[in-house]
């Protein structure tokens, strides 16, 4: 069947170092737990994370993030799933695409990571 | 079966601070992001606040920035807003709520626990 | 901030008739629009989310629809225990923001 995915529709927010959590889903709710799931970055369509046949893909992912990604998936059975990116780099900013892929059927939505330096301060002064 | 259940409000002085708790079960609590949306005596649903589902990120509305603090303890499935400096106006019953990632409804809520600040 | 608006404040209807309820916001939330019912001493009950999807358990009479800045929640014939407030919401961007509220009371 047919399905939306949807993302943040406003910028997350991660401070160089932490962690940043991405977070999407599809619409309406179903179980994804036989689909595949993934990011990637746009427009340059690095992979970011995959998976697929129940299982992570660490093969697949751009060298820049291996080691770096977890799937959170404890609600995939809803159509939910998080991807946290661990050590967040500057070079992690950019926009970033979810999908979610049931046989052929492909759906996706597009969401943006900033990423602030903790020890950046402005004199209000 | 999904369930929220709030505690700690009652009555309290204009200035006094209380600290509402909301025990969560039957989901992966830490999975989800929480909310406090609150109802003033016959009126309509304001948010408060949201914590992420690890809890490193929070949010206010600006009626309570400053006042409010949410946080969250996963480790005992466990919710709460430490309100303080009280104001006439904070009276209402407060309702925990969940969402998914900041990027979803409320789909469940909790019965609410009822704040009331006079003298 | 984005503001919800919805109308009308007062809805009167008998049962079996249509109701249909407005909620507008002031700049566009695309579909991240949900709607609540809520009955006197009771918590917000999720109907609808991102739009025009029911949430699980909920009648088929209840539907919503629109996109961007204009939605509409249609209830196709009342039951007598639709009567009660409902609430809009978007939650797109922070501060997630609250219609006023529907009042669907009995004519």
């Known amino acids: 069947g047919q399905f939306r995915v949807i993302g943040p529709g406003y910028p997350i927010r991660a401070l160089v170092g932490d962690e940043a959590e991405l977070p999407c889903r599809i619409s309406p709710g179903k179980n994804a737990t036989g689909m595949e799931v993934g990011w990637y970055r746009s427009p340059f369509s690095r992979v970011v994370h995959l998976y697929r046949n129940g299982k992570d893909q660490d093969a697949e992912q751009a060298p820049e993030y291996r080691g770096r990604t977890e799937l959170l998936k404890e609600t995939i059975s809803e159509g939910k799933v998080t991807l946290r990116i661990q050590n967040v780099r500057f070079s992690d900013e950019g926009g970033y695409t979810c999908f979610f892929r049931d046989h052929s059927y492909q759906e996706e939505a597009a969401m943006e990571l900033k990423v602030e330096d903790p020890f950046y301060w402005v004199n209000p002064g | 079966q999904v369930q929220l259940v709030e505690s700690g409000g009652g009555l309290v002085q204009p200035g006094g601070s209380l600290r509402l708790s909301c025990a969560a079960s039957?989901?992966?609590?830490?999975?989800?992001?929480m909310n406090w949306v609150r109802q003033a005596p016959g009126k309509g649903l304001e948010w408060v606040s949201a914590i992420s589902g690890s809890g490193g990120s929070t949010y206010y509305a600006d009626s309570v920035k400053g006042r409010f603090t949410i946080s969250r303890d996963n480790s005992k499935n466990t919710l709460y807003l430490q309100v303080n400096s009280l104001r006439a106006e904070d009276t209402a019953v407060y309702y925990c709520?969940?969402?998914?990632?900041?990027?979803?409804?409320?789909?469940?809520w909790g019965q609410g626990t009822l704040v009331t600040v006079s003298s | 901030e984005i503001v919800m608006t919805q109308s009308p404040a007062t809805l009167s209807l008998s049962p079996g008739e249509r109701a249909t309820l407005s909620c507008r916001a002031s700049q566009s939330v695309s579909s991240y629009l949900a709607w609540y019912q809520q009955k006197p001493g009771q918590a917000p009950r999720l109907l609808i989310y991102?739009?025009?999807n029911r949430a699980t358990g909920i009648p088929a009479r209840f539907s919503g629809s629109g996109s961007g800045t204009d939605f509409t929640l249609t209830i196709s014939r009342l039951e007598p225990e639709d009567f009660a407030v409902y609430y809009c919401q978007q939650y797109g961007s922070s501060p997630y923001t609250f219609g006023q509220g529907t009042r669907l009371e009995i004519k």
């Open positions: 991102d739009a025009s």
């Open positions: 039957g989901f992966t609590f830490s999975s989800y992001a």
């Open positions: 709520a969940r969402d998914y990632g900041g990027i979803s409804p409320f789909d469940y």
